[in-house]
Every structure is written in structure tokens, then in C-alpha cells.
């Protein structure tokens, strides 16, 4: 691509940098953990780590005073805040996809096993529609490891 064709990418990048997608992550994790609860699994068994916010001092999280509430009491609140954030990407499907990819990347280390990963991915794909937004047609949610070095 010509380098100045990337300008749209940078405007999307600007939005992604400023977006607080943590409510989306919280909403989805609560959702899949509630599903597991209904199948008799305890998401808070000692073998599993509870959610801990990512260590980024520049990203304060006003929504998350504690780990995921397993009763799901705050889930609708998280979903509303999540939808408000995703609404910013409504008219740019490629950017919406990148937002979903970022959510997947942020949570990939916290998902236990292939089954939970697939379930998270499935819920993530449905997230825009849950918010009454258009879902991106083609959006690869496979997690790449790290960035690309250039020396």
C-alpha cells in the first residue's frame, strides 16, 4: 500500500487508543463464566485465576473496583458501557473488527483451555449485534503473538 493510504488506519488507531474496551471484556467474561456455572463448573475454583485488570497506569478503569462479579449483578452495566464504546466504531466496519481483535488479545491470556477460548470468541462475534450494531462481515479473531519487529 502507498504510505498515505494508511491515513484511515491511523484514524482508526486513534480511536482504538482512546477506547475503553474493558467493560466489554468484563461483560463477556461474566457471560461465559455464568454459562460455566450453569454447567456446574466454578469459575473461581483455586486452579483458575480471577480477573485482574491489565497493568497499564495510563488506562485507569473507573468501572472495575473488584474482580468479575460471579452473580452477574454488574453485567448489564458493563454491557451498556461496552455498547457505548463500540458505538464509536459503528460506521467503520474494519475499525469495529480491530476493536473486537483488541478485546480478544487483551483476554487471550486469561482464557483457560480451547473450549473457553472458543466460547469467548463466539460471544465476541455476537457482541455488536447484542448492542444493536452491525457486525463486521469478515473479522479474524485469531490472536497473533506480539508485534512485528523491524530493526
Amino acid at each position: 500500500r502507498q504510505q498515505w493510504e494508511l491515513q484511515g488506519d491511523r484514524r482508526c488507531q486513534s480511536q482504538l487508543e482512546r477506547a475503553n474496551l474493558r467493560p466489554c471484556e468484563q461483560h463477556l467474561m461474566q457471560k461465559i463464566q455464568r454459562d460455566e456455572d450453569s454447567y456446574g463448573r466454578d469459575p473461581y475454583s483455586p486452579s483458575q485465576d480471577p480477573y485482574s485488570p491489565s497493568q497499564d497506569p495510563d488506562r485507569r478503569d473507573p468501572y472495575s473496583p473488584s474482580p468479575y462479579d460471579r452473580r452477574g449483578a454488574g453485567s448489564s452495566q458493563h454491557q451498556e458501557r461496552c455498547c457505548n464504546e463500540l458505538n464509536e466504531f459503528e460506521n467503520n466496519q474494519r475499525c469495529m473488527c480491530e476493536a473486537l481483535q483488541q478485546i480478544m488479545e487483551n483476554q487471550s491470556d486469561r482464557l483457560q483451555g480451547r473450549q473457553q477460548e472458543q466460547q469467548f470468541k463466539r460471544e465476541l462475534r455476537n457482541l455488536p449485534q447484542q448492542c444493536g450494531l452491525r457486525a463486521p462481515q469478515r473479522c479474524d479473531l485469531e490472536v497473533e503473538s506480539g508485534g512485528r519487529d523491524r530493526y
Epitope: 488506519d9 487508543e17 467503520n92
Partner: antibody, heavy 112, light 109 residues
């Protein structure tokens, strides 16, 4: 963002300035490079995205600047070649498309 | 292009700095204007005050306000404080090259 120390170079030489990021996920944000000659305004040189591998340079610096990075040590680099006296300036790296965080600056002096 | 090049305002008074972009910085897909305002105090690195033309960066006092549309933008300091003495720059980041304005030097009258 912590930048490397001051450099003194001769005309025609190259300089490589480093910018070490910490406290956030390096691949999440773009890095820009901006320079400022003494008593002058800010001049945008270009940008790099460590996640996508993309870079873009201002026309003025084309063929003379290379922006690179090492994700494993969360460090960005800006190399400027064929230095001339008018390249004497403070060089800043900045985080994010809108430059929300700035390095402390690296003074590059070009003098014979 | 920024105007004026320099500005002297009394303490407690309003200061207004203008910035004109050569092209629109509005992204119609998200209705955001990709223009930022920076403050640089003598001997210091620049600091982001406003992004997306009107969104205040966290920690920036609410006396700083960004406004404007299309190609004409304004930074307003509602009540000038002594610590506001600095050079102010606008920057468009709608499309590369992400050019800065030439700067406006703000002093106390």
C-alpha cells in the same frame, strides 16, 4: 518514554536515537517522531506502528530517515542519515496517534 | 496556520488562539475532528491539552476549551493563570503529514 542521551555528530554522519517505552503494552500505540530546532516550532517527522509493522515519513525526510523498533524490549528507534547543520534539534518520540505522551527529548548537534 | 503569533492577556482574562487547517479534519465515519492542541512551557517537552478538537486530556484544567468545525478551530483559556504562560501549538492528525501550526506565544499583559 525514556530517550537516549545527547549526540554530537559531524555533517554527513548518521544518528540513531532510541525511545524505551514502559508502563503499557508497546504494540497498542503508535510512536511518532517530532523534532524542534532551538527557538523554533514543532516539526512532525513520521510515525510507526509496532503491531502492524507500518511506517510513514514526512516527505522532507524521505530517503534520510528510518524508523524501527524491537518489540521484545519495547524500544523504538529513529535513524537520520546524511546529517547537516540544520538537523541540529531536540528529537522527541511521542506515544499515540495524538501524541498524548512525550519522551524527554534527545539533543542532536551537527557541527564540523 | 495559527493566529496570532503572540498574544498578551491580563491575568484572569480570556485568551483565544485560532488554528486554520488547509483541509477538513472531520472524519465523517465517526464525526470526529482530528485536531489536537499542545502546550509547551519554556525548557519543557510539549504536553497534550485537547484531542479530537474538543476533548480535554485527563488532568487538564477545565479553563482550557477546544472548539471549531471544518477547518477553523479555537483554543480558549477562560481565565488566564500565571502558569499558562507558554507556546501553544495545534496539530492536525487527520491525514499525514501530521503538521503542527507554527505556534502562538502566550504572555501576561
Amino acid at each position: 518514554l525514556v530517550q537516549s542521551g545527547a549526540e554530537v555528530k559531524k555533517p554527513g554522519a548518521s544518528v540513531k536515537v532510541s525511545c524505551k517505552a514502559s508502563g503499557y503494552t508497546f504494540t497498542r500505540y503508535d510512536i511518532n517522531w517530532v523534532r524542534q530546532a532551538t527557538g523554533q516550532g514543532l516539526e512532525w517527522m513520521g510515525w510507526m506502528n509496532p503491531k502492524s509493522g507500518e511506517t510513514g515519513y514526512a516527505q522532507k525526510f524521505h530517503g534520510r530517515v528510518i524508523m524501527s523498533w524491537n518489540t521484545s524490549i519495547s524500544t523504538a528507534y529513529m535513524e537520520l542519515s546524511s546529517l547537516r547543520s540544520e538537523d541540529t534539534a531536540v528529537y522527541y518520540c511521542t506515544r499515540g496517534v495524538d501524541s498524548g505522551v512525550w519522551g524527554q527529548g534527545t539533543t542532536v548537534t551537527v557541527s564540523s | 496556520t495559527q493566529s496570532p503569533d503572540s498574544l498578551a492577556v491580563s491575568l484572569g482574562e480570556r485568551a483565544t488562539i485560532n488554528c486554520k487547517s488547509s483541509q477538513s479534519v472531520l472524519d465523517s465515519s465517526n464525526n470526529k475532528k482530528f485536531l489536537a492542541w499542545f502546550q509547551q512551557k519554556p525548557g519543557q517537552r510539549p504536553k497534550l491539552l485537547i484531542y479530537w478538537a474538543s476533548t480535554r486530556e485527563s488532568g487538564v484544567p477545565d479553563r482550557f476549551t477546544g472548539s471549531g468545525s471544518g477547518t477553523d478551530f479555537t483554543l480558549t483559556i477562560s481565565s488566564l493563570q500565571a502558569e499558562d504562560v507558554a507556546v501553544y501549538y495545534c496539530q492536525q492528525y487527520y491525514s499525514p503529514p501530521h503538521t503542527f501550526g507554527q505556534g502562538t506565544k502566550l504572555e501576561i499583559k
